[in-house]
């Protein structure tokens, strides 16, 4: 199952994805695609980075975070209903079958006639990440969980320990911070 993220028509959608570079600026290529992660690469690529910078992009798709520090979260500007669906964040770790894949489901809701600020999702993780979305409507502050730094060997262990908590799904499906190196 994918973790679900919501945004309203006309606003900006935010899909979180993180990793920890082995050294500052020692980047791992990342791709974002529309559709679930395939075996290799990303299908329907909307944005891609190499070891230095963004080298493939399409309009309305941005990395607004500090991607050189591993924040490769995707911002989609001025969303429409057609932007609904599953998105793949793929961290292309060198080596055979080492890639980390995260499927994130984006649900776009019609704009409210009288919009009022609402919390997008009630994450339980500490250190929430504050994001202000910008769109045609008023600014809306959404609280998004920022999950703890872990290394690859800790993922399954933590997921088992937290199986019964709401954090488990977030960890397994999209929120984990992958440590490279």
């Amino acid at each position: 199952s994918e973790v679900e993220y919501r945004a309203e028509v006309g606003q900006n959608a935010y899909l979180p994805c993180f990793y920890t570079p082995a050294a500052p600026g020692n980047l791992v290529p990342v791709c974002w695609g529309k559709g679930a992660c395939p075996v290799f690469e990303c299908g329907n690529v909307v944005l891609r980075t190499d070891e230095r910078d963004v080298n493939y992009w399409t309009s309305r798709y941005w990395l607004n975070g500090d991607f050189r520090k591993g924040d490769v979260s995707l911002t989609i500007e001025n969303v429409t209903l057609a932007d609904s669906g599953i998105y793949c964040c793929r961290i292309q770790i060198p080596g055979i079958m080492n890639d980390e894949k995260f499927n994130l489901k984006l649900v776009i809701k019609p704009a409210k006639v009288t919009p009022a600020p609402t919390r997008q999702r009630d994450f339980t993780a500490a250190f929430p990440r504050m994001l202000t979305t910008r769109g045609h409507g008023p600014a809306e502050t959404q609280t998004l969980g920022s999950l703890p730094d872990i290394n690859l060997t800790q993922i399954s262990t933590l997921a088992n320990e937290l199986r019964d908590s709401r954090l488990a799904n977030d960890l397994r499906d999209s929120g984990a911070t992958i440590r490279i190196g």
Partner: antibody
Framework: QVQLQESGPGLVKPSQTLSLTCTVS?????????WNWIRQPPGKGLEWMGY???????SYNPSLKSRITISVDTSKNQFSLKLSSVTAADTAVYYC???????????WGQGTTVTVSS | DIQMTQSPSSLSASVGDRVTITCKAS??????VAWYQQKPGKAPKSLIY???YRYSGVPSRFSGSGSGTDFTLTISSLQPEDFATYYC????????FGGGTKVEIK
């Protein structure tokens, strides 16, 4: 290894249109990156002119926007610069370069000199 | 339009010297600054991007620092092949270059 090579007439008359082509080898233009034109008047500094992206979208230096067109020929893996209504101030070495979405430039052509004179 | 003011416009130095070139942006450009080296009759070469990251193959004696409006290129120990003109540029969102700094032999 990515290589870029500029080509075009070395002499253009005032008020005419300057046309240059950059041939890219070792990488497909449509696979990614921004494909830029930069110029350098004799004895002066560098001026970014604009780019065309892998998807065909363009971004131009506001000071040249009314005169500049950058286009791409994917079948030849080339991109081109057209600069209209040239004057002597457009005399320069013209470089093509491959850049990122944030336009900084990792690969450059060797440059071609264009003189605007009657 | 963001202006990049580079200083000095020229300097004389000897092999082994530590050389510092500065660039000041007319407004905040974050870390969106690159540095290039150009030798006479040649195309520029990328040295530094995103203010402080060395491009591949660039010797470790070259380093960049700064953010916001003030940026610095440092050559820790000048080598004979380093005598050239250096340009800073900002890319936020358009690209504008500094006026250049010519590093000459003393």
């Amino acid at each position: 290894q990515v290589q870029l090579q500029e080509s075009g007439p070395g002499l253009v008359k005032p008020s005419q249109t300057l046309s240059l082509t950059c041939t890219v080898s070792g990488y497909s233009i449509t696979s990614g990156f921004a494909w830029n034109w930069i110029r350098q008047p004799p004895g002066k500094g560098l001026e970014w002119m604009g780019y065309i992206s892998h998807s065909g979208s363009t971004s131009y230096n506001p000071s040249l926007k009314s005169r500049i067109t950058i286009s791409v020929d994917t079948s030849k893996n080339q991109f081109s610069l057209k600069l209209s209504s040239v004057t002597a101030a457009d005399t320069a070495v013209y470089y093509c370069a491959r850049g990122y979405r944030s336009p900084w430039f990792a690969y450059w052509g060797q440059g071609t000199t264009v003189t605007v004179s009657s | 339009d963001i202006q990049m003011t580079q200083s000095p416009s020229s300097l004389s130095a000897s092999v082994g010297d530590r050389v510092t070139i500065t660039c000041k942006a007319s407004q905040n450009v974050g870390a969106n600054v690159a540095w290039y080296q150009q030798k006479p009759g040649k195309a520029p070469k990328s040295l530094i991007y995103s203010a402080s990251y060395r491009y591949s193959g660039v010797p470790s004696r070259f380093s960049g620092s700064g953010s916001g409006t003030d940026f610095t290129l440092t050559i820790s120990s000048l080598q004979p092949e380093d005598f050239a003109t250096y340009y800073c540029s900002q890319y936020n969102p358009y690209n504008t270059f500094g006026g250049g700094t010519k590093v000459e032999i003393k």
